[in-house]
């Protein structure tokens, strides 16, 4: 069972990404990840989280925003935004620490 080692009861989440096996998944929490790769439009992925809850606490940057929630289908209608573009002298702060 691929979700056996998750903390606590499992929740059902909306799954919308190229790697989803169906419209929903089950995990320890629900996720929304907004990612903008260089030269591309931002893409929003919805799914399940089982590892590295610390990602949920990371600050949004101009490249990525992570959102997590803990109830049934709680990630279904969430829309995220990225931070405003940083000055060119600054590096993107993707390190969540």
């Amino acid at each position: 069972d691929p979700v056996k080692p998750s903390r606590g009861p499992l929740v059902t989440c909306t799954c919308e990404s190229p790697h989803c096996k169906g419209p929903t998944c089950r995990g320890a929490w629900c996720t929304v990840v907004l990612v903008r790769e260089e030269g591309r439009h931002p893409q929003e992925h919805r799914g399940c989280g089982n590892l590295h809850r610390e990602l949920c606490r990371g600050r949004p940057t101009e490249f990525v925003n992570h959102y997590c929630c803990d109830s049934h289908l709680c990630n279904h209608n969430v829309s995220l935004v990225l931070e405003a573009t940083q000055p060119p002298s600054e590096q993107p702060g993707t390190d969540g620490q």
């Epitope: 990840v33 992925h45 590295h52």
Partner: antibody
Framework: QVQLQESGPGLVKPSQTLSLTCTVS??????????WNWIRQHPGKGLEWIGY???????YYNPSLKSRVTISVDTSKNQFSLKLSSVTAADTAVYYC??????????WGQGTLVTVSS | EIVLTQSPGTLSLSPGERATLSCRAS???????LAWYQQKPGQAPRLLIY???SRATGIPDRFSGSGSGTDFTLTISRLEPEDFAVYYC?????????FGQGTRLEIK
């Protein structure tokens, strides 16, 4: 079958930057189920976790190395990379990349020895 | 930061005997994310056990894991010649990822 392969120089001069790349085959680095890690092992010693990157580009690093480490991902090439700056002889080690899932570090590269010497 | 301490440092046993390796955490941890690895000289570590007690794909059933809270155990019920190696426990799945210092299992 998922495979990971480390590549990069085997010899780095002191004070320079160590750069390694891990190429993933047989699976997508963009899957949200996985986290992509670097680990090292000094000669005759135990395993030391360096840090991980998620497909989104978010990173977490070992606090003892954080000031010198950068991990990046290139999803288009299915690769992730390690840079370790200001190296000294103490950074001589075998460097491994590994995939992390709910089932632990289930796939590892074979490891590459990096020697820091002038 | 949680520290994992493995004991003994070296374990000397003969083929056919039972091996019991210990991993103790400095504070209580989730048993969902405790793994064991085997490493032989010149090779990468190999995943044996994840989630404290689940065997990884292809791992013989003579390997078993147990424990909770702060105390975890890897048991090899009947040692085969190929089992003599170094074994590491690990906490994964949350920051920071940590490894124990290893137990060397050697032939007596």
């Amino acid at each position: 079958q998922v495979q990971l392969q480390e590549s990069g120089p085997g010899l780095v001069k002191p004070s320079q930057t160590l750069s390694l790349t891990c190429t993933v085959s047989g699976g997508s680095i963009s899957s949200g189920e996985y986290y992509w890690n670097w680990i090292r092992q000094h000669p005759g010693k135990g395993l030391e976790w360096i840090g991980y990157i998620y497909y989104s580009g978010s990173t977490y690093y070992n606090p003892s190395l954080k000031s010198r480490v950068t991990i990046s991902v290139d999803t288009s090439k299915n690769q992730f990379s390690l840079k370790l700056s200001s190296v000294t002889a103490a950074d001589t080690a075998v460097y491994y990349c590994a995939r992390e899932s709910v089932a632990g570090f289930d796939y590892w590269g074979q490891g590459t020895l990096v020697t820091v010497s002038s | 930061e949680i520290v994992l301490t493995q004991s003994p440092g070296t374990l000397s046993l003969s083929p056919g005997e039972r091996a019991t390796l210990s991993c103790r955490a400095s504070q209580s941890v989730s048993s969902s994310y405790l793994a064991w690895y085997q490493q032989k000289p010149g090779q990468a570590p190999r995943l044996l056990i994840y989630g404290t007690s689940s065997r990884a794909t292809g791992i013989p059933d003579r390997f078993s894991g147990s424990g909770s809270g702060t105390d975890f155990t890897l048991t090899i019920s009947r040692l085969e010649p190929e089992d003599f190696a170094v074994y590491y426990c690990q906490l994964y799945g949350s920051f920071p990822i940590t490894f124990g210092q290893g137990t060397r299992l050697e032939i007596k």
